[in-house]
Amino acid sequence: ACDTATCVTHRLAGLLSRSGGVVKNNFVPTNVGSKAF
């Protein structure tokens, strides 16, 4: 899977959207590596 910074950001945004925003606050692009997905 794509692991550029932009890909990670968009994937995380999708995950947050699907979770209804309940993902913990420190789950942000600069803290999350591509392996987290």
């Epitope: 550029t4 932009t6 950001t9 968009h10 947050l16 600069t30």
Partner: antibody, heavy 119, light 107 residues
Framework: EVQLVQSGAEVKKPGASVKVSCKAS????????MNWVRQAPGQRLEWMGD????????NYNQKFKGRVTITVDKSASTAYMELSSLRSEDTAVYYC????????????WGQGTTVTVSS | DIQMTQSPSSLSASVGDRVTITCKAS??????VAWFQQKPGKAPKSLIY???YRYSGVPSRFSGSGSGTDFTLTISSLQPEDFATYYC?????????FGGGTKVEIK
Amino acid sequence: EVQLVQSGAEVKKPGASVKVSCKASGYTFTDYYMNWVRQAPGQRLEWMGDINPNSGGTNYNQKFKGRVTITVDKSASTAYMELSSLRSEDTAVYYCASIIIVPNYFDYWGQGTTVTVSS
Amino acid sequence: DIQMTQSPSSLSASVGDRVTITCKASQNVDTNVAWFQQKPGKAPKSLIYSASYRYSGVPSRFSGSGSGTDFTLTISSLQPEDFATYYCQQYNNYPYTFGGGTKVEIK
């Protein structure tokens, strides 16, 4: 309101260096990557590199062969792009840009900084 | 580096026309493509990410499609404010690369 405000226009001599700043507000600066993109007159956009403001980790476009350095000052919520060994072809508008998720999912861009390289 | 080839480089159209701009990547970039609109003297404005998703606030007349190497931006009914230059960008691999732009002019 998310804003990326860049420093003012610069005129430099060939061989000199320029450092452009980008002050972020309206979001948590360290949460999102910052990109730098430039556009020479009449040319396509060109990605220069990005930085993780949280860790300081960077990715660069190898076209610039070590001439570009991207840094941040977390305490000032400001990103910097320094380009060294300037030549006339570096005359361009330089932009910072960041994709933010919170408070609004959008790709925000600075207003641009014109750098003119001329002897 | 991945090359992004846009076509046409310019086009003339009238208000209300349907406009299609294409972008071809030199290798597979999945759906990791964005589209931008730029007006003279202004910063680019983001329209589309992940090939087909509109950012909030982007009018529904703008739509994107494609995957792999072939991508399309469509403006279903051109409005006066849409006359601008449009760029595609791939962010699947570093360095990110942009297409050469398509200038949409008034006929």
